[in-house]
């Protein structure tokens, strides 16, 4: 049999730096663990060690730390240039800055392939791009042949900024003609690398005719044999076998997310091609990897411009934005406003002359803003002073709710009001009318929303029974601060942005920001 | 599509030695092992051994180290056994495979 | 070595009827196991790898489970081209072991 490692990543976005164990800005250096210093050692340790090493990479490398702000993409062409990844499928934060921002800095300075067989350009742009991307690529390992098919998910031009000039097809349909292709190739052994989401993983692995391992991203999913070596809780053991509708075992792999882990994957094939084996874990990039020193350095020099950038004006307040505990814990607070307004016109995508916008609402818990910004230091906002707002390094994410889910969340955030607990809610496109004269869990006598499917935007009641589009913290989706309905049902999650981005991006956008109170959270006692 | 193509059926001698071939085509015959197994009536399948023809490398089953030596040439994509000091316990169907895929057998009867 | 016990050792079943074939592994495989079919002029085919993974051109009747150390092979119903001789093979470490055969017969 001839045996293939596959090392794999997914949904780095950004964490060219160690970081703390849960991604964040690294503090203690002995306990930080990924970066891609680090990686580098791992690969090459590996790569020293057995015969046939692939290293791919399954989307979402842009968005999400200053790094990407800065460089804009241009540091993950280097620095996957330097690890020397053999291939790359496109993820939907690929295309954040537009096309425009995928193409110059990394589909043009790439050393490798950047793979998608369901993304089809069109009209300009398919001249343009041509080539930069593609859909397959047939890679030489050792004296075999591995083809390499890509797929990005379909949600895209709801989640980035694609443009009208690319068009995302269903993947399974556009994957079989490229695998087919591969097949009248000779090419006997094919891997699927892509990024919509560990079901579509499993759907590929299942439908797709020819593919004979999945490495995928988008939903950071953990999968491990055996005792997991950090805080990560296994979605189910690594690899995750799929039985494919003509009867083929087909591991599926995905490697959480934020550069923690090097998927590690060990391939048996027989002379057909066939997986006749497989198994590995993801492993843990903690401190006891050392980080190459010349990938450190590199980075060291890299990191210069980001530390001018943080003191640069964004843009200018001309009120004091109210972000203080007092405030955003208790009522509407500016700042709450502030961030949820960014949060929305982060989401603008007019892909349906239907609706104005795919999405109106937003949520944001008051315990996420961590610190006000006062306008009488010449109006100033700077990216270190966002840091100061919202330090925790998360993403605002796109989900869907139904509109009973809602309620309760909204029920929650006044459960125990009073007592400067982080769950009180801001929001965006949504009133709230709270009465808390009444009992916990029955506290919301008003609750109206921003319709989406309208040319004239204006509020109506909720609906239980209908699904929303919401903008919210990652940390929401994930249940945090008691909000265990959201993550028990919803019914799709995909993440963002980086926080301070999002709203640093708005900042300088509209150069000069005023944001109000005005209503949108409101108190009444007895009948309104 | 993969296929072995084995030698033709050998007598021998007792105490004799005897070479059989396997030709492979169809696939990179460089970076696959090829087993070899025995067949006897009444006796079941036994596996003999195996070797990488890309570097040569060979992993014996320790009832028959001494009795097969496997060899391989890349450049004609054909593996070898040879059988020595040959005794009427060694006659018997002899296959090459892939881990997918068989050659149709080598009938060696030793007999004096 | 790891010992590979089939059973039965030989099998008599109709036309249309569903057979199981079984072989225990004395220690453990890892689902790294095959199962091949000899014909009468004693050609090798290969029906399931990896447990249970269907080699392609193998008619669906075919499938490959496992419990624990127990390997089967199930034929859901028998057609007249099935009545041959079966084996599987474990090759999880060396030396890779054959299970003793199931010689299937029409009744």
């Known amino acids: 049999a001839w045996e293939l490692t596959i090392l794999h990543t997914n949904d780095v976005h950004s964490r060219l730096e160690q970081t703390s164990e849960d991604s964040s800005k690294c503090v203690n250096a002995s306990r930080c663990m990924g970066g891609v210093a680090r990686l580098f050692t791992k690969v090459q340790q590996i790569r020293r060690a057995e015969p046939n090493v692939l290293l791919l990479d399954a989307g979402d490398q842009y968005q999400g730390t200053i790094w990407f702000t800065v460089y804009k993409g241009a540091e993950v062409a280097h620095f996957m240039n330097a690890l020397r990844y053999d291939a790359m499928a496109l993820g939907n934060h690929e295309f954040d800055n537009g096309v425009e921002g995928l193409i110059e800095p990394l589909l043009k300075e790439a050393k490798f392939p950047i793979l998608s067989a369901n993304i089809k350009a069109k009209g300009p742009l398919a001249s343009q791009i041509s080539g930069l991307y593609l859909p397959y690529k047939v890679l030489p390992v050792g004296d075999e042949v591995v083809g390499i098919v890509g797929y990005t998910s379909k949600e895209t031009p709801f989640l980035s900024n694609p443009g009208t000039n690319l068009v995302f097809e269903d993947e399974i349909t556009a994957l079989q003609p490229e695998v087919d292709k591969l097949k009248t190739l000779n090419v006997n052994k094919i891997i699927a690398l892509g990024h919509s989401g560990f079901e579509m993983d499993k759907l590929i692995a299942q439908k797709v005719r020819g593919v004979d391992v999945v490495v995928g991203g988008h939903s950071n999913t953990f999968l491990y044999t055996g005792n997991p070596p950090s805080k990560e809780v296994p979605a189910g053991k690594y690899p995750f076998i799929v039985t494919s509708d003509d009867g083929r075992k087909v591991p599926v792999v995905q490697a959480y997310a934020f550069g923690k882990y090097l998927g590690y994957l060990k391939i048996e094939f027989d002379e057909r091609g066939n997986v006749i084996s497989s198994h590995g874990n993801p492993i843990l990039l903690n401190s006891s990897i050392p980080e190459d020193p010349s990938i450190k350095a590199d980075i060291n020099k890299w990191r210069i411009k980001l530390d001018n950038y943080s003191t640069q004006e964004l843009g200018k307040t001309i009120v004091y934005l109210d972000g203080s505990s007092q405030s955003c814990r208790f009522r509407e607070c500016n700042m709450g406003n502030l961030i949820c307004d960014a949060m929305i016109n982060n989401n603008l995508r007019h892909t349906d002359e239907m609706f104005w916008n795919h999405v109106s609402m937003c949520i944001l818990n008051g315990g996420g803003i961590r610190s006000p910004i006062d306008e009488r230091n010449n109006g100033t906002i700077t990216w270190e002073n966002l840091a100061a707002v919202l330090p925790f390094g998360g993403t605002f994410d796109l989900v869907q709710l139904k509109g009973s889910t809602l309620k309760k969340a909204f029920e929650h955030s006044v459960h125990r009001y009073g007592q400067s607990t982080g769950e009180f809610l801001q929001v965006g496109g949504i009133h709230v009318v709270y009465d808390l004269s009444r009992k916990p869990g029955d506290r919301v006598v008003k609750l109206d929303v921003l319709c989406t499917k309208c040319r004239v935007p204006s509020y109506d009641p909720l609906k239980m029974d209908e699904v929303y589009k919401v903008i919210l913290p990652n940390f929401l989706a994930n249940g945090g601060d008691g909000f265990q309905m959201i993550k028990d049902e919803l019914l799709r999650h995909d993440s963002g942005d980086q926080d301070i981005n999002v709203v640093s991006t708005y900042i300088s956008k509209m150069k000069v920001i005023y944001p109000a109170v005005e209503g949108r959270i409101k108190f009444s006692t007895g009948s309104h | 599509q993969v296929q072995l193509q084995q030698s033709g059926a050998e007598v021998v001698k007792p105490g004799a030695s005897v070479k059989i071939s396997c030709k492979a085509s169809?696939?990179?015959?460089?970076?696959?092992?090829i087993n070899w197994v025995k067949q006897r009536p009444g006796k079941g399948l036994e596996w003999i051994g195996k070797?990488?023809?890309?570097?040569?490398?060979?992993d014996y089953n320790g009832n028959f180290k001494g009795k097969a030596t496997l060899t391989a040439d890349k450049s004609s994509s054909t593996a070898y056994m040879q059988l020595s000091s040959l005794t009427s316990e060694d006659s018997a169907v002899y296959f090459c495979?892939?881990?997918?895929?068989w050659g149709q057998g080598t009938l060696v009867t030793v007999s004096a | 070595d790891i010992q590979m016990t089939q059973s039965p050792s030989s099998l008599s079943a109709s036309l249309g009827e569903r057979v199981s074939l079984t072989c225990r592994a004395s220690?453990?495989?890892?689902?790294?196991l095959i199962w091949l079919q000899q014909e009468p002029d004693g050609t090798f085919k290969r029906l399931i790898y990896?447990?249970?993974s269907l080699d392609s051109g193998v008619p669906k009747r075919f499938s490959g489970s496992s419990s624990g150390s127990d390997y089967s092979l199930t034929i859901s119903r028998l057609e007249s081209e099935d009545f041959v001789d079966y084996y599987c093979?474990?090759?999880?470490?060396?030396?890779?072991?054959f299970g003793g055969g199931t010689k299937l017969e029409i009744k």
């Open positions: 220690q453990d495989i890892g689902e790294r």
């Open positions: 070797i990488f023809p890309g570097n040569g490398d060979t």
């Open positions: 990896a447990t249970s």
């Open positions: 169809g696939y990179v015959f460089s970076s696959y092992w």
């Open positions: 495979a892939g881990f997918a895929d």
């Open positions: 093979l474990q090759y999880a470490s060396s030396p890779y072991t």
